[in-house]
Interface confidence: medium
């Protein structure tokens, strides 16, 4: 069975507001849910649509959403159908309307002492409460010969007299909100002695130092008085002008002229007419000083051919509101066509390359004119001037690959090496024109290179293969000075590469031939048993047909490698005594001895009075202290090799002899006693 977990419920709703009728069903099988309004299926619209099983209203409409809604769940397999409870909206709304004359039938029939009834055509649900106004002042019921019927939304004036003349408006409010009359009613009941408006002053906007004119006329029998006031109630007459209104003139017909207007003259001017009887009539008009601010700068724009683009010109703040127009090449743009002005926007449809250039937005009002240029570039797809070519580049020299293209705007060129983007570093440089420079070509630079040239309109790419022409070179270059151990076997390697595999041979620098125990095997010089005579200068020669030959000179030294005759031993010394660390080494050339203590080399010239290194290499430390404890390393070295040996030094407190120990008891460890 289909069960409603949540049913829609009737509810209050506000015109134009969001609402939701909730519906949730549970059923053993799949069901589809739809809604009925007064028995007819509800179609989804942007305003009213199904949201899950519920019905969502983006904006309630009192006409389209009045009626009874029902949620229907249907099992399409079994045909079973269930309907929810009915739900409807109590839609609250309020709509403005005019104030109209209900009685008498026409304005021509209005005479002093007749009854006048006005009706407020503001409607709403729930019925709103009405408030009447004359000349903007609220009217309360039962006051001054008028009655207000809220139910009938009528205002009755009985009898109507000249004092009731004025502009009648109404406002109404309800739970939904409030509204005021869209059109007001001017009641005019003549009393010759009452001042009546003939000409009311209008708000004026003028440029600085220009003149402003306010017209004001009243009529009455006898003629009424007329007075002008400014802002702070300062009267303006031709005899007494306030200091900041020196250039004000009041004409006989009531008009007020202000010349050379300055900012301090801006404000509210009141024209007051007073008849022999009746209230004074106060008319207000404002003098605004025209102003116009600067326009914001445009960023240059890049568009693509064939597209449609818009550039909005934000008009500068100003009074009166500045008018805005676009110009191109000194000509004002039309309001239709392919390139035209729409509102404040410059519209370019189906952009062509010829549309590129400077467009100017102009804004102007009484205060002046402002303009701002926007530079429009029409992007084109790059075209080739010179594609990269398959190239042979020489190792060790700079290599260049061209990628010359042209487009608007100037294209951006990027290079890829083996599909990897090349980022500029010490070896690679991309010139402004797109050419790639490889600063020092290496063998492994022989691969595929691809350049891509792009603008917003599109991109083109091309690739080229680089073959590196290897130079003839030793790989690696032989060490210029090498040592061989006397009476031992030794080898001196020499290898080289080039565009063609080079031939390698050794010879003595003095031109003498190699002895029979020395062989040259594919570039490796082999000494079966090193003799003193093998020392000397040798040359390795690598050569091939296309590249000639290269030579590497090697000085071979024959040496007896270092061995230690005496090595330092683990030593323990009483504090304050002397420590001796012995070290003697032999070899040819005769080795030099250095000591390292506590991880620093002991410089014989900076040892101080407590330490000394003897000619034979031994290290002596007088008056030892606990901080002298540590690992000491004896380093023996000559021009051919280096060897080291180490031993720890322990500094201990001298024990105080106990009674039980005889004077001759030995210490518990090997000691140096001095």
């Amino acid at each position: 069975a289909i069960v409603f977990i949540k049913q829609p419920s009737s509810q209050d709703a506000l015109q134009g507001r969001r609402a939701l009728l909730r519906c949730e069903v549970e059923a053993p099988g799949p069901v589809h849910v739809y809604w009925l309004l007064d028995g007819a299926p509800v179609q989804d619209t942007e305003r009213r649509f199904a949201q899950g099983s519920s019905l969502s209203f983006a904006a309630v409409d009192r006409l389209q959403d009045s009626g009874t809604f029902q949620c229907v769940a249907r099992d399409d397999v079994t045909g079973e159908e269930a309907r929810s409870a009915n739900a409807s909206f109590n839609i609250k709304w309020i709509e403005a309307g005019p104030v109209v004359l209900k009685h008498p039938a026409s304005e021509a029939e209005i005479q002093p002492q007749t009854q006048v009834t006005l009706r407020c055509h503001i409607d709403g649900h729930p019925r709103p409460t009405y408030q009447w106004f004359r000349d903007g002042t609220p009217l309360s019921d039962g006051q001054s010969n008028h009655t207000v019927s809220s139910k009938e939304r009528n205002l009755t004036l009985r009898p109507a007299g000249p004092e009731h003349s004025g502009l009648y408006s109404c406002c109404a409010h309800s739970a939904f909100g409030q509204a005021c009359s869209s059109q007001n009613f001017t009641l005019s009941i003549a009393d010759e002695s009452f001042a009546r408006v003939v000409l009311a002053p209008q708000d004026v906007v003028v440029a600085r130092y220009e003149e402003a004119m306010f017209h004001c006329q009243f009529s009455a029998q006898p003629p009424p008085s007329l007075q002008w006031l400014f802002e702070d109630e300062t009267p303006i007459t031709n005899r007494s002008r306030p200091p900041h209104l020196r250039r004000a003139t009041v004409f006989a017909n009531g008009s007020l002229l202000l010349t050379q207007v300055r900012p301090r003259n801006a404000g509210i001017y009141r024209c007051i007419g007073q008849g022999q009887r009746g209230p004074p009539i106060i008319l207000e008009a404002t003098l605004h000083l025209a102003e116009i601010e600067d326009m914001p700068l445009f960023e240059p724009r890049v568009f693509t051919a064939g597209s449609e683009e818009r550039v909005t010109c934000l008009p500068p703040k100003g009074l009166p509101e500045p008018s805005v127009w676009w110009e191109h090449a000194g000509v004002r743009l039309p309001t239709h066509g392919r390139v035209y002005q729409k509102g404040h926007e410059l519209v370019l449809a189906n952009i062509a390359e010829s549309d590129a250039g400077v467009y100017t937005c102009h804004a102007a009002n009484l205060a002046g004119q402002r303009r701002q240029d926007v530079n429009i570039t029409v992007a084109t797809v790059p075209s080739w001037l010179k594609k990269p070519q398959d190239s042979q580049l020489e190792e060790g020299k700079p290599g260049y690959l061209d990628c010359l293209t042209q487009a608007t705007p100037k294209p951006t060129v990027v290079w890829y090496r083996n599909q990897m983007l090349i980022s500029e570093d010490s070896r690679f440089e991309v010139f402004k024109n797109g050419t790639l420079r490889i600063n020092s070509v290496e063998v492994y630079d022989g691969t595929w290179y691809r350049c891509m040239s792009s603008t917003p309109a599109g991109s083109i790419e091309a690739q080229a293969r680089v073959q590196v022409l290897e130079k003839l070179k030793f790989t690696p270059p032989p060490q210029p000075q090498q040592c061989m151990e006397f009476d031992k076997e030794a080898t001196v390697p020499c290898s080289a590469t080039g565009r063609e595999k080079p031939t390698i041979k050794w010879e003595r620098a003095d031109g003498s031939s190699l002895p029979e125990w020395v062989t040259d095997n594919a570039g490796t010089l082999h000494f079966a048993r090193v003799t003193r005579d093998d020392a000397g200068n040798y040359t390795c020669i690598a050569s091939n047909g296309p590249q000639g030959q290269i030579r590497a000179h090697v000085q071979l030294t024959v040496a007896v490698f270092i061995t230690f005759k005496v090595e330092p031993e683990r030593t323990t010394v009483y504090q304050g005594h002397t420590a001796l660390l012995q070290c003697e080494a032999q070899g040819d050339p005769k080795p030099l001895i250095q000591w390292k203590g506590k991880d620093r080399i002991l410089d014989p010239t900076k040892l101080g009075p407590r330490m000394h290194i003897f000619q034979n290499g031994s290290l002596v430390i007088h008056d030892v202290a606990p901080e002298d404890s540590g690992r000491y390393t004896c380093i023996a070295g000559n021009s051919c090799n280096i060897k080291h040996t180490e031993a720890p030094l322990y500094v201990v407190d001298k024990p105080v002899p106990e009674e039980s120990e005889g004077p001759g008891s030995p210490p518990p460890y090997k000691m140096i006693q001095t």
């Epitope: 949540k6 049913q7 829609p8 419920s9 009737s10 509810q11 209050d12 506000l14 134009g16 507001r17 969001r18 609402a19 939701l20 909730r22 739900a87 109590n90 609250k92 739970a175 939904f176 909100g177």
Partner: antibody
Framework: QVQLVQSGAEVKKPGASVKVSCKAS????????INWVRQAPGQGLEWMGD????????VYNQKFMARVTMTVDKSINTAYMELSRLRSDDTAVYYC????????????WGQGTLVTVSS | EIVLTQSPATLSVSPGERATLSCRAS??????IHWYQQKPGQAPRLLIK???ESISGIPARFSGSGSGTEFTLTISSLQSEDIAVYYC?????????FGQGTKLEIK
């Protein structure tokens, strides 16, 4: 994250007006109603009205209709509530709260603004 | 306007026990009821919307039920941090209204 930050505490004299601001961040300001709820000292919560920031259209509680004005400034994602002709019983903490899509419940609240009305 | 009456005004419950708070509407409002928790010096926090729908980030011990005019907020196992005032609110009709609140205390 969604945040509503209100203006600071105010002390006003009877008859004066007060304008409380509520700056929203962390969501699209025009998508959700902003509600105003007040709470007098030691009392419960009272709904004053709401405003649709997209259209600027308010709905007021009838009780406050003659004295309250709700506005928004979309350019700075800020809602305002102005209460005029203040009385001593308007002393309360005034909260702004973001409604759900339909404006019916309030899942995000401002920190509250204490308005004290005293002669 | 729709009047919401909450009962009891104060409720004392032992930690770990169930707390049941009631809210009655003066007319049928369907499921347009929402529950809030308010701790001293803080803004209210939404617990349950539309009578029974949970809110992300709210512990599962808070649940709601009811429709029409009778609504209930249940805290299945009271924790010390649940001490607060709880309000119901209706959105069926303008003006939106709140109940007068139920103060929840630890027994």
């Amino acid at each position: 994250q969604v945040q509503l930050v209100q203006s600071g505490a105010e002390v006003k004299k009877p008859g004066a007006s007060v304008k409380v601001s509520c700056k929203a961040s962390g969501y699209t300001f025009t998508d959700y109603y902003i509600n105003w709820v007040r709470q007098a000292p030691g009392q419960g919560l009272e709904w004053m009205g709401d405003i649709n920031p997209y259209s600027g259209g308010p709905v007021y509680n009838q009780k406050f209709m003659a004295r309250v004005t709700m506005t928004v400034d979309k350019s700075i994602n800020t809602a305002y509530m102005e209460l005029s002709r203040l009385r001593s019983d308007d002393t309360a903490v005034y909260y702004c709260a973001r409604g759900d899509y339909y404006g019916s419940n309030y899942n995000y609240w401002g920190q509250g603004t204490l308005v004290t009305v005293s002669s | 306007e729709i009047v919401l009456t909450q009962s009891p005004a104060t409720l004392s419950v032992s930690p770990g026990e169930r707390a049941t708070l009631s809210c009655r509407a003066s007319q049928n409002i369907g499921t347009s009821i929402h529950w809030y928790q308010q701790k001293p010096g803080q803004a209210p926090r939404l617990l349950i919307k539309f009578a029974s729908e949970s809110i992300s980030g709210i512990p599962a011990r808070f649940s709601g039920s009811g429709s029409g005019t009778e609504f209930t907020l249940t805290i299945s196992s009271l924790q010390s941090e649940d001490i607060a005032v709880y309000y119901c609110q209706q959105s069926n009709n303008w003006p939106y209204t709140f109940g007068q609140g139920t103060k929840l205390e630890i027994k």
